[in-house]
Interface confidence: low
């Protein structure tokens, strides 16, 4: 189920799957929500630790049991991923942080009159992930009203420093507030060039596009279909970026499909989940559980309810069925995508709907914080 | 909203506009989306006004002037007014609207979390009121959704300011001693939301007040936490599953 309570002065021991710098616990929680394996997080505000390297540290954690031992740590904040929390799942983060400088690659500097205008510039720049703004009272006069647009390899700051008269924040592209607009077109038999930022396996180009949309550095993608000539590259989804923000070249190529991230769309973004079920397809991955259920939809529901489950395969092989119920294989992987995709099997596969934000499985829990 | 500023897209995605289509169409009240098919508002929005078929509910909007005849809207399936609401009093000023068709959630249209039943222990320090209502007492409906940050006032303090009315424990007040910031006509039924532990909660429903933004005359809101049992009871579907965003 959905657990939204935060544990103050508590730190989860062990289970680390990733770490990064975030300006507060809420942003850390959001990163945990969108991380394929993160179930729990712990955040160290600047006031909670003397170690400069760990200040603003956000630690994403996994646990087979869904929980980890809590240790007392003054100032620390811990909590749960919002996977399975329906409408609360959003990559949109509007807060502006005063007295904080979020470090990254500064690729654009301009003079603006307010932090809101700086945030708007970041939102309207295809490469900008976060920004810092030096206010009118910044100690160095030449930097006053400077708006620095930034990016980093992981989409989060490479460091966060406490600095007076500086305000920082994130792009509002995930809030569907970008003025850039987006290309909805899917280009059949076309491959894009440029830098690959990640490689995952997907059953179709639409899943590839959604993954690209929610990847911090993906601006466009190329997908190799299941009939692509090189067997080892079938169903490969290449997430790509470039200096200019658009592909520098494209090559006509049979059985490839290319397209763009939808992060810059106005007013509507795709849901960060994939609801389609793929008949005759087997998704390979680490086995989480096997259960007998009646029908592929129940298998998908079972996967959705089991928070660690990322995808599933429902087998219709006679040896996998008992009366009306057949085996439902609940699976996971490091990146949330299948480790192999096989065709022509007797069964169907699909993804957990745990990140869908339209489900009625969501609740707003209001348990008080544990001190 | 008096003393407020323009909101931005998706900032208050639960805010809805309750409009009546008669000879003309106008915004009358605000409301809060609390589930795919449920809106929470003030009972007094329906005082003496045509019901059901003439109401249009607009969600996921920022600017009322963007509404055209082609703008999608929800229609009302059922209005549930609190059984103890009396037109003559400020008490129990709460109503639920069941929409004819469920809404999909987007960044611009999604529900607000409700408080837990009888929530009295939480100290809310970051509270906002939103709406398209008048920006001054003798004003007019605003085009762009307005927001204003207003501190909560204790019921004891509020009662001192309203000697002629009973401020009950099922009300919550908000305002500045010096006035200047408040809800006003047309904001009724809309949300008073407070951010706590990174999450927005619906603390109040805009209900009444003497004038708007007057000195030592806080706004009075229906306290949602006091009506959680009622909300849950009324929103249970026939299969017993709550159709709104209820506390665990």
């Amino acid at each position: 189920g959905c657990l939204t309570q935060l544990y103050e002065n508590a730190f989860f021991r062990g289970g680390d799957v990733a770490s990064m710098y975030t300006p507060n616990a809420q942003y850390c929680q959001m990163r945990c929500t969108f991380h394929p394996r993160c179930l729990l997080f712990s955040f160290l505000p600047a006031s909670s630790i003397n170690d400069m390297e760990k200040r603003f540290g956000c630690f994403l954690k996994d646990s087979v049991t869904g929980t980890l031992p809590k240790v007392h740590r003054t100032g620390a904040v811990s909590g749960h991923s919002l996977k399975q929390c329906g409408h609360q799942i959003s990559a949109c983060h509007r807060d502006i942080y005063k007295g904080v400088d979020m470090r990254g690659v500064n690729f654009n500097v301009s003079k603006v009159s307010s932090v809101e205008e700086c945030q708007k510039r970041c939102t309207s720049n295809i490469r900008c992930q976060f920004f810092s703004y030096a206010t009118q009272t910044f100690h160095k006069a030449e930097y006053r009203n400077n708006c620095l647009l930034k990016y980093s390899p992981g989409g989060t700051p490479t460091a966060i420093k406490v600095l007076s008269n500086v305000e920082s924040g994130f792009s509002l592209k995930p809030c569907a507030l970008s003025e850039i607009g987006c290309h909805m077109n899917i280009f059949q038999h076309l491959a894009f060039s440029d830098v690959d930022v990640a490689r995952v396996l997907t059953p179709d180009a639409f899943v590839c596009r959604t993954i690209c949309t929610y990847h911090p550095n993906c601006l466009f993608f190329t997908f190799y279909t299941n009939v692509w000539k090189i067997e080892s590259q079938r169903n490969v989804c290449l997430l790509k970026t470039s200096e200019s923000g658009t592909p520098s070249s494209s090559t006509p190529q049979e059985n490839t499909i290319s397209g763009y991230s939808l992060l810059t769309c106005k007013r509507t973004l795709p849901e960060p989940c994939h609801s389609k079920i793929y008949p005759g397809v087997d998704f390979g991955g680490e086995e989480l559980n096997v259960t007998f259920v009646k029908g592929v939809n129940v298998c998908q529901e079972t996967c959705t309810k089991m928070i660690r489950c990322q995808f599933f395969t429902y087998s219709l092989l006679p040896e996998d069925c008992k009366e009306e119920k057949c085996k439902c294989f609940l699976r996971l992987s490091m990146d949330g995508s299948p480790t192999r995709i096989a065709y022509g099997t007797q069964g169907s596969s699909g993804y957990s709907l745990r990140l869908c934000n339209t489900g009625d499985n969501s609740v707003c829990t209001t348990k008080t914080s544990t001190r | 909203i008096v003393g407020g500023t323009n909101s931005s897209w998706g900032e208050w995605p639960w805010q809805v506009s309750l409009q009546v289509k008669l000879t003309a169409q106008r915004h009358l009240c605000g409301g809060s989306l609390i589930g795919h098919q449920w809106v929470l508002t003030a009972a007094h929005c329906f005082d003496g006004l045509p019901l059901q078929d003439v109401w249009r509910i607009y969600s996921g909007i920022l600017n009322l002037s963007d509404i055209t005849k082609d703008t999608p809207f929800s229609q009302i399936k059922e209005i549930i007014i609190h059984q103890n609401y009396k037109v003559s009093e400020g008490n129990h000023d709460i109503a639920l609207i069941k929409l004819q068709a469920p809404l999909n959630y987007t960044e611009f249209q999604k529900p607000i979390c409700l408080p837990s039943k009888g929530d009295t222990s939480t100290i809310y320090t970051n509270c906002w009121v939103t709406g398209w209502g008048f920006s001054k007492e003798k004003g007019e409906i605003q085009n762009i959704l307005q927001k204003v940050n207003i501190p909560l006032v204790t019921n004891e303090e509020c009662q001192k300011r309203y000697q002629d009315y009973k401020i009950t424990q099922r009300m919550v007040c908000a305002g500045y001693k010096e006035g200047g910031k408040d809800a006003c006509k047309g904001d009724s039924g809309g949300p008073l939301v407070c951010k706590h532990n990174g999450m927005w909660r619906l603390v109040g429903i805009t209900s009444w007040g003497e004038g708007c933004a007057r000195r030592e005359q806080p706004g009075v809101y229906t306290k949602v936490a006091e009506y959680m049992d009622w909300i849950l009871e009324k929103t249970q579907s026939s299969d017993g599953k709550a159709q709104m965003q209820s506390p665990a």
């Epitope: - | 106008r26 009315y165 004038g211």
Partner: antibody, heavy 122, light 106 residues
């Protein structure tokens, strides 16, 4: 003290026009729904027209639709009824009324003026 | 439009009598019904709203009941001051009055 005072009634020929006014005092006029209700001699009450607080919504009984126009001037605390194409059956005492029940920012209906007589006759 | 039908149209009664007036709506109006008293040459005076809520200052001998389409005004013990015409009024969809019930001395 709360008061509603109608004026503008009188004798008019069929097809003629009249403009009724209702001056309000003793309450925040701009916060309330205002109404016109009429009563033909020896007959019952008939609701004629209503106007919402901001003036944006106006509603009419079928019997007067297209001929009568309700309006208000919140700065003058005054309600109006412009009556055109008058007919003999419009002869009545015209009352203005407002919904005063309850706490501020409410919209409910019960305070009445004393009425003004409109006679349509040739 | 919603029609309101009152009965009886005239009622003869004596001081001390219990008097009941009924009002029927052509469709459900929930509890959005008011009762008024009117004396000759005077404006109507609100007695009851929301079907059963007594307006402040109105004697407790007046009471209202009903919901949906059937409503009743009851005067538990008729007083000399109560001889007048009574109107019901719906305010569910627009505003419609019943045709009135005249309560006269028997």
């Amino acid at each position: 003290e709360v008061q509603l005072l109608e004026s503008g009634g009188g004798l008019v020929q069929p097809g003629g026009s009249l403009r009724l006014s209702c001056a309000a005092s003793g309450f925040t006029f701009s916060h309330y729904i205002m109404m016109w209700v009429r009563q033909a001699p020896g007959k019952g009450l008939e609701w004629v027209s209503g106007i919402y607080s901001s003036g944006g919504i106006t509603v009419y009984a079928d019997s007067v639709k297209g001929r009568f126009t309700i309006s208000r001037d919140n700065s003058k605390n005054t309600l109006y009824l412009q009556m055109n194409s008058l007919r003999a059956e419009d002869t009545a005492v015209y009352y203005c009324a407002y919904r005063r029940i309850g706490v501020p920012r409410r919209d409910s209906f019960d305070m009445w003026g004393q009425g003004t007589m409109v006679t349509v006759s040739s | 439009d919603i029609q309101m039908t009152q009965s009886p149209s005239t009622l003869s009664a004596s001081v001390g009598d219990r008097v009941t007036i009924t009002c029927r709506a052509s469709q459900s109006i929930s509890s959005w019904l008011a009762w008024y008293q009117q004396k000759p040459g005077k404006a109507p005076n609100l007695l009851i709203y929301k079907a059963s809520t007594l307006e402040s200052g109105v004697p407790s001998r007046f009471s209202g009941s009903g919901s949906g389409t059937e409503f009743t005004l009851t005067i538990s013990s008729l007083q000399p001051d109560d001889f007048a015409t009574y109107y019901c009024q719906q305010y569910n969809t627009y505003w419609t009055f019943g045709q009135g019930t005249k309560v006269e001395i028997k």
